[in-house]
């Protein structure tokens, strides 16, 4: 039997330096977690102790702190080459600053193989990317050879700005060839590593032929066998055994997100490259684990243009940017508006030429907003200033929800009405009227929604039954702020860019603002 | 300590349906797969299909496609095995068996006789 | 279908003797291979798995080994408890198939 040992990471999100236990901001040193010089000291200590090692990455190393907004991917290429990546697979954030934004800071100055199968380019690209990415890649392990075979979620070009030029294929469909391929050349031990999210990472191992191992991301899942360490819960045993349809146990681990677990899987193969045992756990990086002290010093000169960025104008305002709780939470703000239009700005994803775009709904929880801006500072808007609007660090997502979902959650929005309350929701492609003289959960009389599947954008009724896709920060997803209804009903979830990322880009874009309070919520006469 | 649990002896006529069901206890019942097997009077065991009631993946043996159907039902922890158009050549113990990572059918239940007699 | 053929398809032993069954597939199966004892009105009991990892509990003196088409059960110290039918399975392919089985009786 030959032992091999997959350490991996996946959805890491410009976490390059240490978070705390929720993956913001790091504030008490003791009690963080995670980022890259911690990393390297766990990989380094596993490469010393056992013989055969690999480590992977599934994608998403691209967008979630500042990191990724001042260098571009330039951070992800230089610190992955430092702790000595085997070999990446494409995620869809990788997309996000379009085809040039992924080839020039990562592609062309990766040392690691950066892997995807289902993704095909064509005219003018074609030859451009040519062996920048690749299907698969055959690595030497010890005395043996390992091949690993790429895919990317077959949903990135409603997700990021791949453009034109890349198609994105079913990725059993894709998966296949490629694997078959890896046989004829005597490879006997195949890992499938992938950014589709759990379920087709489980798909994978039951459908995709020859595949030994899946190695995912994109769902943030985390899998523990045993008591976990942290505040993670498990949505099943690591690693996860899938009973492929020829009949074969394949093993499907993920490993949570932003860093703050390395994945840690020993797989025993026999000498036909069946897999015969495996075991392990996602290890949770903290403060036990030191930092390892030349990647550390590296992270904190290449912090130095950071704290430069975080003054330096991003555009400008005209108006007062009113993210007060006095309005936010009672009414329609203007902060609330200029956000939600920098999320839908955001979502512009022209791939149908029967709609106009996607998405046209945003919903934002009024207590997510924690600070107005000013404009009599000569109108200036900085990262910092942006940083004290949204101090969380969480993403806005894109969902989606039946219209019977929607209106349980304006009826939440309201429940409660006048105390101050966080849920107060704030809107963007929606015209909402409620009557508060009504009883709590039969309060939103109007609910009209913005079309998509139009020339010219309109405002519809709501329909019940209909399946909507909104834009919403991720506390909501999760069901934040008591919307427990978009947690249990949502039908698809997808994590989208740093929540002060779209805003800042959005800023920036625009250069000068002048967002208005504009009837998107209204009251009907006789209540408000 | 894990325990497959079978329903009670069965005597049905040619052309009927059974339906046997296996009640598990003593582990998570939607993180293992549940394999139905069957074993004819003095024949070798035969291996009938599979259900995972994690996300209700199913695998049947082409022999017993179109007149087997293996279920879940994961509020009960149980897993049920219909078998139709039963001949008299259906006649045998069926097993239900829980598989442990690498070991296939590594639990089994105590076993349910079937009996097939016009 | 892969086809399992034991042999012997029965055995007389006495307590203490070493005793071989083997295992041939009509195929290549590598070394996915299980091993289950069964005793009459019960249900088989998985010994071992993978040509030669015993389950849980399984005593030492059960042990596996084969590779490709030819596979063996031994078991090196017979007990009395050890008297049974014994079958084998390969587990490579679907469907998974098993051995006609090899009943071992008390000489």
């Known amino acids: 039997a030959w032992e091999l040992t997959i350490l991996h990471t996946n959805d890491v999100h410009s976490r390059l330096e240490q978070t705390s236990e929720d993956s913001s901001k790091c504030v008490n040193a003791s009690r963080c977690m995670g980022g890259v010089a911690r990393l390297f000291t766990k990989v380094q200590q596993i490469r010393r102790a056992e013989p055969n090692v690999l480590l992977l990455d599934a994608g998403d190393q691209y967008q979630g702190t500042i990191w990724f907004t001042v260098y571009k991917g330039a951070e992800v290429a230089h610190f992955m080459n430092a702790l000595r990546y085997d070999a990446m697979a494409l995620g869809n954030h990788e997309f996000d600053n379009g085809v040039e934004g992924l080839i020039e800071p990562l592609l062309k100055e990766a040392k690691f193989p950066i892997l995807s199968a289902n993704i095909k380019a064509k005219g003018p690209l074609a030859s451009q990317i040519s062996g920048l990415y690749l299907p698969y890649k055959v690595l030497p392990v010890g005395d043996e050879v390992v091949g690993i075979v790429g895919y990317t979620s077959k949903e990135t070009p409603f997700l990021s700005n791949p453009g034109t030029n890349l198609v994105f294929e079913d990725e059993i469909t894709a998966l296949q060839p490629e694997v078959d391929k890896l046989k004829t050349l005597n490879v006997n031990k195949i890992i499938a590593l992938g950014h589709s999210g759990f379920e087709m990472d489980k798909l994978i191992a039951q459908k995709v032929r020859g595949v030994d191992v899946v190695v995912g991301g994109h769902s943030n899942t985390f899998l523990y066998t045993g008591n976990p360490p942290s505040k993670e819960v498990p949505a099943g045993k690591y690693p996860f055994i899938v009973t492929s349809d020829d009949g074969r146990k394949v093993p499907v681990v993920q490993a949570y997100a932003f860093g703050k677990y390395l994945g840690y899987l020993k797989i025993e193969f026999d000498e036909r490259g069946n897999v015969i045992s495996s075991h392990g756990n996602p290890i949770l990086l903290n403060s036990s684990i030191p930092e390892d002290p030349s990647i550390k010093a590296d992270i904190n000169k290449w912090r130095i243009k950071l704290d430069n960025y975080s003054t330096q104008e991003l555009g400008k305002t005209i108006v007062y940017l009113d993210g007060s709780s006095q309005s936010c939470r009672f009414r329609e703000c203007n902060m609330g508006n200029l956000i939600c239009d920098a999320m839908i700005n955001n979502n512009l994803r022209h791939t149908d030429e029967m709609f106009w775009n996607h998405v046209s709904m945003c919903i934002l929880n009024g207590g997510g907003i924690r600070s107005p801006i000013d404009e009599r500072n000569n109108g200036t808007i900085t990262w910092e200033n942006l940083a004290a609007v949204l101090p969380f660090g969480g993403t806005f997502d894109l969902v989606q929800l039946k219209g019977s979902t929607l209106k349980k959650a304006f009826e939440h929005s309201v429940h409660r009405y006048g105390q101050s309350t966080g849920e107060f929701l704030q809107v963007g492609g929606i015209h909402v009227v409620y009557d508060l003289s009504r009883k709590p959960g039969d309060r939103v009389v109007k609910l009209d929604v913005l079309c998509t599947k139009c020339r010219v954008p309109s405002y519809d009724p709501l329909k019940m039954d209909e399946v909507y896709k909104v834009i919403l920060p991720n506390f909501l997803a999760n069901g934040g702020d008591g919307f427990q209804m978009i947690k249990d009903e949502l039908l698809r979830h997808d994590s989208g860019d740093q929540d002060i990322n779209v805003v800042s880009t959005y800023i920036s874009k625009m250069k000068v603002i002048y967002p208005a309070v504009e009837g998107r919520i209204k009251f009907s006469t006789g209540s408000h | 300590q894990v325990q497959l649990v079978q329903s009670g002896a069965e005597v049905k006529k040619p052309g009927a349906s059974v339906k046997v069901s296996c009640k598990t206890s003593?582990?998570?019942?939607?993180?293992?797969?549940i394999y139905w097997v069957r074993q004819a009077p003095g024949q070798r065991l035969e291996w009938m299909g599979w259900?995972?009631?994690?996300?209700?993946?199913?695998k049947y043996n082409e022999k017993f496609k179109g007149r087997v159907t293996i279920t879940a039902d994961t509020s009960a922890s149980t897993a049920y095995m219909e078998l139709s158009s039963l001949r008299s050549e259906d006649t045998a113990v069926y097993y239900c068996?829980?598989?442990?990572?690498?070991?296939?059918?590594?639990?089994w239940g105590q076993g349910t006789l079937v009996t097939v007699s016009s | 279908d892969i086809q399992m053929t034991q042999s012997p398809s029965s055995l007389s032993a006495s307590v203490g003797d070493r005793v071989t069954i083997t295992c041939k597939a009509s195929?290549?199966?590598?070394?996915?291979v299980a091993w289950y004892q069964q005793k009459p009105g019960k249900a088989p009991k998985l010994l071992i798995y993978?040509?030669?990892t015993r389950h849980t509990g399984v005593p030492s003196r059960f042990s596996g080994s084969g590779s490709g088409t030819d596979h063996t059960l031994t078991i090196s110290s017979l007990q009395p408890e050890d008297f049974a039918t014994y079958y084998c399975?390969?587990?490579?392919?679907?469907?998974?198939?098993f051995g006609q089985g090899t009943k071992l009786e008390i000489k």
């Open positions: 068996a829980r598989d442990d990572n690498y070991a296939w059918f590594a639990y």
């Open positions: 003593g582990y998570t019942f939607t993180n293992y797969y």
């Open positions: 259900i995972y009631p994690g996300n209700l993946n199913i």
């Open positions: 195929q290549d199966v590598s070394t996915a």
């Open positions: 993978w040509t030669n």
């Open positions: 399975q390969q587990h490579y392919s679907t469907p998974f198939t």
